[in-house]
């Protein structure tokens, strides 16, 4: 669809005569008839197949024709067509004299014709005017013409219909050839597909409007490139959706079991060394001078009664000091200046001379010890505490501080490791000499039955089109992560590509 436009510019008829040579009375009141038709090698009369148009009287004899496109569209003359422009044409322009006001062909005498010109040729669609001038013996006509497409028609022959639009069936304007030019943010054959936020993951993200990034199930983040871990995952991460890969020092299905109590809680005091010994279990190795499960108790160095021969012990910042009784000397009052004559043996001890009286030795009665029988027997020296229990002197008595897992006066009783129900997911606990063992129900494994090995929802390969399957361990269901070009809960549906234009 388009318009053949003819711009009449100047008509010269200096003598004011008709084609017959007869003069017009009083002058040639001139109007034009235009016939546009298909190309003819020799332009002949016949139907004006592309259209006709007539003008009113434009002037007398010789005159210039005013451009009147703004005031009614009379000049240029418009010859619209509703077909593909063929690129060739024939044009007949007749100048007629109008004796009266009736310009209909049947109302005019045949000799009212002033001049007739006929041209033919090629004409491409375009904005540029072609200027032409036709001269006969008595007249001259200057004019220009062109073919342009109607609104919304494009292409070399005005055959491509294109209407700009900005709705959900397309976001585009039309190029001169009728092809679509997508508005910013849109793509696709009809510019109906939004361009997602730059960097939005191709498979895991999508969008319904430009610069948006909406995440598919199992993914999160601004660009949908972060997987969502298993629901309830505490100290773990994922590389694919619904995983829970534990951080260092954590274990269990939800990575909520502390396997590195030492690092996470630093329970050992006073510079002691901490060793992990199981879930929420640890052992502190105390530095000298400290005791207690967490080495929280400061141990007096005099508690071990290092001073012999009745020497009295004094604690000092950097150790201890022995104050020796008369007749003794040395770091621990271990050297004697006495002999049996000095009655050095206390608590009924018997004295025996040694080295020809230069030295002596005391034989102590029961419950006493020391080189001078000056010490009551330390009740802890016999290591009465079993199972690695720590013996503590408490005045006349003693007590055992037991290691975890043991109890009783002498730590001789084994606390059942099973008492705290360590086996997860209904596992059965068995006490062993050195710990415990869990017998796991179907679907679970691991030292504490903490690893779920339940029916793998992905085992049946429910996802189509090479999609990736993830098992949601909390519900024993699966999630399919579709490759580009497929959608659906099982990625079973291809995203259709629109067929090409029908034009």
């Amino acid at each position: 669809s388009g318009v053949f436009q003819l711009q009449l510019q100047e008509f010269i008829n200096e003598r004011g005569v008709l084609a017959s040579g007869r003069p017009c009375e009083p002058g040639c009141r001139t109007f034009f008839r235009v016939c546009l038709k298909h190309f003819q090698a020799v332009v002949s009369p016949g139907p004006c197949t592309f259209g006709t148009v007539s003008t009113p009287v434009l002037g007398t004899n010789s005159f210039a024709v005013r451009d009147d496109s703004s005031g009614g569209g009379r000049n240029p003359l418009q010859l619209p067509f509703n077909f593909t422009w063929p690129g060739t044409f024939s044009l007949i322009i007749e100048a007629w004299h109008a004796p009266g006001d009736d310009l209909r062909p049947e109302a005019l005498p045949p000799d009212a014709l002033i001049s007739k010109i006929a041209i033919q040729g090629s004409l491409a669609v375009g904005q540029n005017w072609l200027l032409d001038e036709q001269t006969s013996t008595l007249t001259r006509l200057r004019y220009s013409y062109r073919v342009i497409c109607s609104d919304n028609y494009y292409g070399d022959n005005c055959s491509r219909l294109c209407k700009k639009r900005n709705d959900h069936f397309g976001h585009y304007v039309c190029q001169p050839d009728g092809n679509l030019s997508c508005l910013p943010g849109w793509t696709g054959e009809y510019c109906q597909q939004p361009i997602c936020l730059s960097g939005c993951h191709e498979q895991n993200g999508y969008c319904s409007k430009p610069a948006e990034c909406l995440c598919r199930p199992g993914w999160q983040g601004r660009l949908c490139n972060e997987c969502i871990p298993h629901n309830g995952c505490r100290h773990g991460t994922c590389s694919t959706p619904w995983q829970c890969t534990c951080d260092e020092g954590w274990g269990g299905l939800f990575c909520d079991q502390d396997l590195n109590y030492c690092t996470h809680h630093s329970p050992c005091k006073n510079g002691a060394t901490c060793s992990n010994s199981g879930q929420r279990s640890y052992t502190c190795t105390c530095r000298p001078g400290y005791t207690g499960v967490d080495c929280e108790l400061e141990l007096s160095e005099c508690d071990s009664n290092p001073c012999r021969n009745g020497g009295s012990c004094k604690d000092q910042e950097d150790g201890y000091h022995c104050l020796c009784p008369p007749g003794y000397y040395g770091l621990h009052c271990e050297h004697s200046t006495l002999s049996c004559a000095d009655s050095p043996c206390f608590n009924g001890g018997s004295c025996r001379e040694r080295n020809q009286g230069a030295n002596y030795a005391c034989e102590c009665p029961p419950n006493f010890t020391g080189s001078n029988c000056e010490k009551k027997v330390d009740r802890c020296t016999s290591n009465p505490c079993a199972n690695g229990g720590q013996c503590l002197n408490r005045g006349p008595s003693r007590m055992c501080r037991c290691r975890p897992g043991f109890t009783g006066t002498y730590c001789e009783l084994h606390v059942s490791d099973c008492a705290r129900n360590p086996c997860a997911h209904g596992g059965t606990c068995h006490d062993l000499e050195n710990g415990l063992m869990c017998t796991c129900p179907a679907g679970f494994s691991g030292r504490r039955c903490e690893v779920r090995t339940s029916i793998d929802a992905c085992a049946s390969s429910p996802c189509f089109n090479r999609a990736t399957c993830y098992t949601d361990l909390s519900t024993d269901t699966f999630v399919c992560n579709c490759p580009y070009g497929f959608v659906g809960s099982r990625c079973e549906f291809p995203v259709g590509l629109p067929p090409s234009f029908p034009w």
């Epitope: 609104d151 219909l161 959900h168 319904s208 409007k209 549906f493 629109p498 067929p499």
Partner: antibody
Framework: EVQLQESGPGLVKPSETLSLTCTVS??????????WGWIRQPPGKGLEWIGD???????YYNPSLKSRVTISVDTSKNQFSLKLSSVTAADTAVYYC??????FGGGADLWGQGTLVTVSS | SYELTQPPSVSVSPGQTASITCSGE??????VSWYQQKPGQSPVLVIY???MRPSGIPERFSGSNSGDTATLTISGTQAMDEADYYC?????????FGSGTKVT
């Protein structure tokens, strides 16, 4: 051959919510070439466009009904649905689901057979 | 809101040409579709994008659209063409139907 089939209750009480489902058979709802629309026709009257949706869930509604309409899509079931809340007798109509083709400029080239919904107590 | 106006009815003799108009502001700048609906049946698309015919639609159906008016023309009208005809266009994101024309 692709076919559309509407389903849902034929009678709804005033002030309640009208719910209809359109099942697409013989083809996939998951194509960027189509929008899936709802159109209604009161007895003896003309057609009225309600709204449409694409496979990704982008929805467009008639402004005169927007506050009461929800259209959703379930690609796994190859279905899309219409919910119209707070219905009155004026919502009594034959409800059609249709496929609007992008390459046809949005022309609806495929229609369901329609289902009559009457709003009455 | 955008409105499309159609004559309520058009009468035509068999074999003659029926023309149904649809008018709306600057309608020529929008794509127009035409639907045929026979009693008790669902509508059928007969013209899309002003003048394009879907496959299976007879050549006697043609369309045009310029200015403020779109026209559906049925050349050599047959008895089976008796039906209601609706024009439809998109105004921004909203589908708009004409009021319908009964062709007898």
């Amino acid at each position: 051959e692709v076919q559309l089939q509407e389903s849902g209750p034929g009678l709804v009480k005033p002030s309640e919510t009208l719910s209809l489902t359109c099942t697409v058979s013989g083809g996939s709802i998951s194509s960027s070439s189509y929008y899936w629309g709802w159109i209604r026709q009161p007895p003896g009257k003309g057609l009225e466009w309600i709204g449409d949706i694409n496979y990704a869930g982008s929805t467009y509604y008639n402004p005169s009904l927007k506050s009461r309409v929800t259209i959703s899509v379930d690609t796994s079931k190859n279905q899309f649905s219409l919910k119209l809340s707070s219905v009155t007798a004026a919502d009594t109509a034959v409800y059609y689901c249709a496929r609007e083709d992008v390459k046809f400029g949005g022309g609806a080239d495929l229609w369901g057979q329609g289902t009559l919904v009457t709003v009455s107590s | 809101s955008y409105e499309l106006t159609q004559p309520p009815s058009v009468s035509v003799s068999p074999g003659q040409t029926a023309s149904i108009t649809c008018s709306g502001e600057s309608l020529g700048d929008k794509y127009v579709s035409w639907y045929q609906q026979k009693p008790g049946q669902s509508p059928v698309l007969v013209i899309y994008q002003d003048a394009m015919r879907p496959s299976g639609i007879p050549e006697r159906f043609s369309g045009s659209n310029s200015g403020d008016t779109a026209t559906l023309t049925i050349s050599g009208t047959q008895a089976m063409d008796e039906a209601d005809y609706y024009c439809q266009a998109w105004d921004m994101e909203t589908g708009v139907f004409g009021s319908g024309t009964k062709v007898t």
